[in-house]
Interface confidence: low
């Protein structure tokens, strides 16, 4: 999906009002310095691409993020503010339902959500332009 035509300010508002708090809740009890940010993004469409990938694509050691509160709110925000996003997700959602596993908060998931926090931060403050 190409995130270029999303309403970035509306997505930012959704993040500030709720998603950020849900991410903090998920990470509660974890030191902010525990994980190094290894994933980054260079502009807002790129950030949303990385956010979608980390939030909704199961990875080795962390298959359970898609049903977390922050993930559901992320999905809702993208569906509302990114034209045509919902249609592209129908097949992916059906596939997810077939292989959904028991919800477990693993260290790998915590690390992945820490990366997500970094990506959202970058999304919310696009890089200063090089002069």
């Amino acid at each position: 999906y190409d995130f270029t035509n999303c309403d970035f300010e509306k997505i930012k508002a959704a993040y500030l009002s709720t998603i950020s708090k849900d991410l903090i809740t998920y990470m509660s009890g974890t030191k902010s310095t525990e994980f190094n940010n290894t994933v980054s993004c260079s502009n807002r469409p790129h950030c949303l691409t990385e956010i979608q990938s980390l939030t909704f694509n199961p990875t080795a050691g962390c298959a359970s993020l898609a049903k977390e509160m922050f993930a559901m709110k992320t999905k809702a925000a993208l569906a509302i503010w990114c034209p045509g996003y919902s249609e592209t997700q129908i097949n992916a959602t059906q596939a997810m339902k077939k292989r959904r596993k028991r919800k477990v908060t693993t260290n790998k998931c915590l690390e992945q959500v820490s990366q997500l926090q970094g990506l959202w931060r970058r999304f919310n403050r696009p890089l200063l332009k090089q002069q």
Epitope: R121, L128, Q130
Partner: antibody, heavy 121, light 105 residues
């Protein structure tokens, strides 16, 4: 623990340049912005500019544009502020200040100890 | 450029009294931050994003406001609260107000 350690005091002559360093530790240097703020004796805080260590992007206070240059050395986790064409009014304490992204806004959450720059003939 | 005007420049009060510090912006801003500075020290973050107290800041401090008008309130002044307080915005550049000095009467 986040720490910003600045270089020592400098005495310069009018027309010269000064370069102040700010060594960061305790966090991922490229994750946050670095601001430079100065304070003349008995005066208000004055923002000079901001740099993103991630890509070297900068934004300057128009008052200093052309005279101030902000740079970073990512490998050394160090930010630099160079001020040229010094005049007596540039005598001040110069601070580096990390700008974190709190989920409700930007703020300068950690400050260096300050570097005193004295410009005198 | 957004100009921040703090008033009063100096506030002379006694311990136990209530202090109200004002910061007005020349145009609307999203948030206001506040910093405390004592003589010979670097500024310390005091209130983030209008109303969030920084770590270690006592609950007698509070922040409020929106648009162009923001306020820092100290409900009951303690001896350690006497200092200079600066407001700062991040919407357009990073500008500071002129500061309000809270001094012992």
């Amino acid at each position: 623990e986040v720490q910003l350690v600045q270089s020592g005091a400098e005495v310069k002559k009018p027309g010269a340049s000064v370069k102040v360093s700010c060594k960061a530790s305790g966090y991922t240097f490229t994750d946050d912005y670095m601001n430079w703020v100065r304070q003349a004796p008995g005066q208000r805080l004055e923002w000079m500019g901001i740099i993103s260590p991630y890509n070297g992007g900068t934004s300057y206070n128009q008052k200093f544009k052309g005279r101030v240059t902000l740079t970073v050395d990512k490998s050394a986790s160090t930010a630099y502020m160079e001020l040229s064409s010094l005049r007596s009014e540039d005598t001040a304490v110069y601070y580096c200040a990390r700008e974190d992204y709190d989920y409700d806004g930007y703020a300068m959450d950690y400050w260096g100890q300050g570097t005193t720059v004295t410009v005198s003939s | 450029e957004i100009v921040l005007t703090q008033s009063p420049a100096t506030l002379s009060l006694s311990p136990g009294e209530r202090a109200t510090l004002s910061c007005r912006a020349s145009s609307s801003v999203s948030y206001m931050h506040w910093y405390q500075q004592k003589p010979g020290q670097a500024p310390r973050p005091w209130i983030y994003a209008t109303s969030n107290l920084a770590s270690g800041v006592p609950a007698r401090f509070s922040g409020s406001g929106s648009g162009t008008s923001y306020t820092l309130t100290i409900s009951r002044l303690e001896p350690e609260d006497f200092a200079v307080y600066y407001c700062q915005q991040s919407d357009s550049g990073r500008e500071f107000g002129g500061g309000t000095k809270v001094e012992i009467k």
